[in-house]
């Protein structure tokens, strides 16, 4: 871009006519304060482009900056612009007139700012004063911009002398604003809604006084705009919120809602997004399944948990053997359903100090008007094994018969063992397992019965010893996943006159 005359600053005589030409290899135009002043564009014989800006019969009001810019958007390499500044000293005009909004200067932190009182004559001396105090402040003055410095929250006025009269500017008001690093949070009252229900999304900014909110949302694509409401939420720290509300959601309102926040007084900004799903009907669906058989241990507490997803909030019922369960006053049974996220639920059945009678078939059912789901399982109460009796008998044929009876849940296993050295048995010498032996020294028979009312197994094991030629310590041991139990008996040969 080439400007002729080259500038960068001109001081023009009042009432004169002044012509500025900007030339380039691409089309150009003149701008003044984002306005396009009167100008003529031309394409020259040599292929260059020019725009001629004519300032006719100039006055002090023509004082200001002018830019020559490319007048097409051919990319960033053409975003260059050239600036010139024109003064038209005008004794009838003191300070250049200002738009009323430019008299209010918002300052962030301790950043340098400008009080933009400008005069038409670069030779004039200009001073800055606090309005209440008439002492000039020592702040540097730029005739093209104004006073540049760090200012307190006060009221200021500029002064100059034209000829023999003192001229005051308008009053400038400086306000300090709280502008911290911008931190935006977006939340929705619900991110899942049924069609016809409302969508409400809040965008909140903390610790900033002056911010702009800009929303993008699915409805914008079809040109249906929603007017957000912005609120100042008092408190410490201060919060400003913008609320987007759609009273009657449609399926097409599903999608991403983005809140873009920019600070008016600087270039800081942030944006956050949230997804909203509009569904035709409500739903309930299980997120986890349970094994068909659940185990509880006798006299221990057991919590059974079902995780599911639903919208809207469903009702939840638990059943045992087809009978509805409720919290028991004795505190033996606790039912609870809690909302762990917007659409996620955990329903728990807690059995306190489980009893055998609590074994059975359980069902959880979650339902609402649109959908329902249920989950069933069998609760097995495990009971530690007990050896209830270990007895012996001596039939006439010379055999010794040992009978061991015990109970437990799950089904206990029976192990018989023997030890011949009574003094060292069983601590110092491992017992020898007994069972059906090929030598027919012993014969073992075990019967198992499940007692429905007690929900446990009974095991009766009979051990037949063909002949016992010396004293034996015989042990019957029952074992299941809950533990083990055993009893011992000493068996002596028939020929011995005593029994230990």
């Amino acid at each position: 871009l080439v400007i002729t005359p080259p500038g960068p600053e001109f001081v023009l005589n009042i009432s004169s006519t002044f012509v500025l030409t900007c030339s380039s290899s691409a089309p150009v135009m003149w701008e003044q304060m984002s306005q396009v002043p009167w100008q003529e564009a031309a394409m020259n014989q040599d292929g260059t482009f020019s725009s001629v800006l004519t300032l006719t019969n100039v006055t002090g009001g023509d004082t200001g900056e002018y830019f020559c810019v490319y007048n097409n958007s051919l990319g960033p390499e053409l975003s260059e612009r050239k600036r010139i500044y024109i003064f038209v000293p005008d004794p009838t005009m003191g300070f250049l007139p200002m738009d009323s909004e430019d008299l209010f200067i918002f300052v962030t932190d301790v950043t340098e700012t400008t009080i933009p009182c400008r005069v038409t004559d670069p030779q004039l001396e200009v001073t800055l004063h606090e309005k209440k105090v008439d002492i000039p402040l020592h702040v540097p003055y730029d005739h093209q911009r104004g006073f540049i410095g760090t200012f307190e929250d006060k009221t200021y006025i500029c002064k100059t002398t034209i000829g023999d009269r003192e001229v005051d500017s308008d009053t400038y008001y400086v306000y300090s604003l709280q502008v911290s690093s911008i931190n935006v949070s977006v939340n929705a009252v619900q991110t899942v809604v049924r069609q016809g229900e409302s969508i409400t999304i809040r965008c909140i900014v903390m610790g900033n006084d002056v911010v702009n909110f800009q929303w993008t949302y699915p409805r914008m694509k079809s040109g249906r705009l929603v007017e957000p409401v912005t609120d100042y939420l008092f408190g410490v720290p201060s919060r400003i919120g913008s609320i987007l509300h759609i009273p009657t959601a449609e399926l097409s309102d599903s999608g991403t809602y983005t809140c873009n926040v920019s600070v008016s007084v600087n270039d800081h900004g942030d944006e956050k997004a949230i997804n909203v799903t509009v569904i035709e009907n409500g739903y309930v669906r299980l997120l986890e399944t349970l094994e068909d058989v659940q185990i509880a241990e006798l006299h221990r507490s057991r919590t059974l948990q079902v995780v599911f997803e639903a919208y809207p909030t469903p009702s939840v019922l638990w059943f045992k053997d087809n009978r509805t369960l409720g919290d028991s006053s004795a505190g033996e049974l606790v039912l609870s359903t809690r909302n762990v996220s917007e659409t996620r639920y955990v329903s728990e059945l807690t059995l306190v100090r489980v009893k055998v009678s609590e074994a059975g078939y359980y069902t959880m059912r979650a339902f609402h008007a649109d959908d329902q789901v249920q989950l069933s399982f069998k609760l097995q109460v495990n009971v530690p094994v007990r050896v209830l009796e270990l007895s012996e008998s001596h039939p006439a044929n010379g055999e010794q018969i040992l009978r061991c009876r015990g109970r437990g849940m799950p089904q206990p296993n029976v192990t018989w063992s023997t030890c011949r050295d009574l003094k060292r048995c069983p601590r110092k010498l491992s017992p020898t397992p007994l069972g059906n032996s090929s030598k027919e020294e012993s014969q073992l028979e075990t019967n198992v019965t499940f007692w429905e009312e007690d929900q446990e197994y009974e095991v009766v094991s009979t051990l037949r010893l063909r002949h016992v030629d010396q004293p034996l310590s015989v042990r019957c041991m029952l074992q299941n996943s809950m533990g083990r139990d055993s009893q011992e008996v000493t068996v002596v040969p028939h020929s011995l006159p005593f029994k230990v």
């Epitope: 004169s16 002044f18 012509v19 030409t21 030339s23 020019s50 001629v52 004519t54």
Partner: nanobody, 125 residues
Framework: EVQLVESGGGLVQAGGSLRLSCTPS????????MAWFRQAPGNEREFVAA??????????SMKGRLTISRDNVRDNGQKTVFLQMNNLQLQDTATYYC????????????????WGRGTQVTVSS
């Protein structure tokens, strides 16, 4: 280098008319303002008229008796500027100069970088 060649001057009776022409020797791509100035012996150079784009300007001394115009671009890119002077008076006697500028004050001779050698206009009674 661009040269400006003036023509059309001469002796004319008071109340008569003249049409002055100014022709650049080569194309004047960088030139924005074409103007006429005059200088009588012992006087300063005085602005007469100027033309740029679709705009024209006239000095106070001959206002109402002048028309400045420009012909269409010829094949070689040269533009001839014309000054039509009517109802000439004795005090219009002077050397008339053609000048070209790329921008600046329209009325000020200091804004013009290129000057012709001038053409003499003499108004007799």
């Amino acid at each position: 280098e661009v040269q400006l060649v003036e023509s059309g001057g001469g002796l004319v009776q008071a109340g008569g008319s003249l049409r002055l022409s100014c022709t650049p020797s080569i194309t004047t791509a960088g030139t924005t303002i074409m103007a006429w100035f005059r200088q009588a012996p012992g006087n300063e150079r005085e602005f007469v008229a100027a033309i740029w784009g679709s705009k024209t300007a006239y000095g106070d001394s001959m206002k109402g008796r002048l028309t400045i115009s420009r012909d269409n671009v010829r094949d070689n890119g040269q533009k001839t500027v014309f000054l039509q002077m009517n109802n000439l008076q004795l005090q219009d006697t002077a050397t008339y100069y053609c000048a070209a500028s790329s921008g600046g004050y329209v009325h000020s001779s200091t804004s013009y970088e290129i000057w012709g050698r001038g053409t003499q206009v003499t108004v007799s009674s």
